[in-house]
């Protein structure tokens, strides 16, 4: 014969536990029903009556099957440096995460307690570790042969363009400026006519003559005095 299915409330067999989504009520000494997420226990069970559940009120929630007398309060509204990535509902708490360009300097169980702006690397310095949701940017000086002319939390140092003839050599905060050695080819109307560099950047699609010898500039350039360690700006 199949075992009889017990309906809550029921007294458990000695040594056994209550089933899934049930809890043992110490007062009634019975296995009773839990309340579903979004509800709480309005009336606890007795030996003869099961738990009475009620919906959570506005701005309160329960995320799990439970038998709590009151729902939990949702967290406070997200601050101006945060975005609400999960709204407060009867079944889940509000989650605030840092808005783009910020990172979480102090986290809490879910979401973030304190956001801070991502560090910006000043000219001559590039991003050596991109920021994440929970970690700040790390800036490092641009290596010889590379530059960054921006104040940015995302820009890495980029190689100087290679010129047939250099007008102004590049440095850590400025790209090399090339001298135009041939007439600039025709461009679309209104286009700015700039000297054509022999670029190290592959997104420059024009065919470029290659210098007969192109050793790595990082091997050629002497290391100057080290720039100051603070390669970042707080703004």
């Amino acid at each position: 014969l199949p075992a009889q299915v017990a309906f809550t409330p029921y007294a458990p067999e000695p040594g056994s536990t209550c089933r899934l989504r049930e809890y043992y009520d110490q007062t009634a000494q019975m296995c009773c029903s839990k309340c579903s997420p979004g509800q709480h226990a309005k009336v606890f069970c007795t030996k003869t009556s099961d738990t009475v559940c009620d919906s959570c009120e506005d701005s309160t929630y329960t995320q799990l099957w439970n038998w709590v007398p009151e729902c939990l309060s949702c967290g406070s509204r997200c601050s101006s440096d945060q975005v609400e990535t999960q709204a407060c509902t009867r079944e889940q708490n509000r989650i605030c995460t840092c808005r783009p360009g910020w990172y979480c300097a102090l986290s809490k169980q879910e979401g973030c307690r304190l956001c801070a702006p991502l560090r910006k690397c000043r000219p001559g310095f590039g991003v050596a570790r991109p920021g994440t949701e929970t970690s700040d940017v790390v800036c490092k000086p641009c290596a010889p042969g590379t530059f960054s002319n921006t104040t940015s939390s995302t820009d890495i140092c980029r190689p100087h363009q290679i010129c047939n003839v250099v007008a102004i050599p590049g440095n850590a905060s400025m790209d090399a400026v090339c001298t135009s050695t041939s007439p600039t080819r025709s461009m679309a109307p209104g286009a700015v006519h700039l000297p054509q560099p022999v670029s190290t950047r592959s997104q420059h699609t024009q065919p470029t003559p290659e210098p007969s010898t192109a050793p790595s500039t990082s091997f050629l350039l002497p290391m100057g005095p080290s720039p100051p360690a603070e390669g970042s700006t707080g703004d």
Epitope: A143, G145, R158, S218, A229
Partner: antibody
Framework: EVQLVQSGAEVKKPGATVKISCKVS????????IHWVQQAPGKGLEWIGR????????EYAEKFQGRVTITADTSTDTAYMELSSLRSEDTAVYYC???????????WGQGTTVTVSS | QAVVTQEPSLTVSPGGTVTLTCRSS?????????ANWVQQKPGQAFRGLIG???DRAPGVPARFSGSLLGGKAALTLSGAQPEDEAEYYC?????????FGGGTKLTVL
């Protein structure tokens, strides 16, 4: 002249720990991350981790997490990579490098061969 | 940890064009992976060729170019030279660590 000079070859027993050094010269060690990369015989490159000598912060590959410690001593311009609980598959050449993927400051040590054998 | 996959080997004729690719197990490769390409010639030091997906490192010949192609990082060699025969590794950045691909052995034949 930029140089990264690594310590000599090591032979270790399984379970032992090895510590390799990488002495840098020709640049300010605080200006660039120092990376460690593994190349097992006949295999490709495996990134182990990197240290920011300026503040000692480290990042490690998941595969080596818990077994590897990368440090840098700015007073001697030396970076170190310590790998513990060695096993036979750790037999490889280990390189220190300023290659960073972000900086184009591309220098490599000569490599240190570590042989793990009982 | 993510797995980065490359073609184990490719062959190109001298003067020909070949594209090496680099796939990520976590989804399409984006500029946030800062794709890098590193060259290893037998008995020589490693050499970074491409960084930031498509920037050639200083001194790298213009015949090497980097791009994103169909959700993968790509290294294109146009006008291959015998001296380009080498092992090529791609490396992708994942939030706080680099992962190298298995490498592509390029033969110029």
């Amino acid at each position: 002249e930029v140089q990264l000079v690594q310590s000599g070859a090591e032979v270790k027993k399984p379970g032992a720990t090895v510590k390799i050094s990488c002495k840098v010269s020709g640049f300010n060690i605080k200006d660039f991350y120092i990376h460690w990369v593994q190349q097992a015989p006949g295999k490709g490159l495996e990134w182990i981790g990197r240290v920011d000598p300026e503040d000692g912060n480290t990042e490690y590959a998941e595969k080596f997490q818990g077994r590897v410690t990368i440090t840098a001593d700015t007073s001697t311009d030396t970076a170190y990579m310590e790998l513990s609980s060695l096993r036979s598959e750790d037999t490889a050449v280990y390189y220190c490098s300023t290659w960073d993927g972000f900086s184009y400051f591309d220098y490599w040590g000569q490599g240190t061969t570590v042989t793990v054998s009982s | 940890q993510a797995v980065v996959t490359q073609e184990p080997s490719l062959t190109v004729s001298p003067g020909g064009t070949v594209t090496l690719t680099c796939r990520s197990s976590t989804g399409p490769v984006t500029t946030n992976n800062y794709a890098n390409w590193v060259q290893q010639k037998p008995g020589q030091a490693f050499r970074g060729l491409i960084g930031g997906t498509n920037d050639r490192a200083p001194g790298v010949p213009a015949r090497f170019s980097g791009s994103l192609l169909g959700g993968k990082a790509a290294l294109t060699l146009s006008g291959a030279q015998p001296e380009d025969e080498a092992e090529y590794y791609c490396a992708l950045w994942y939030r706080n660590h680099w992962v190298f691909g298995g490498g592509t052995k390029l033969t110029v034949l």
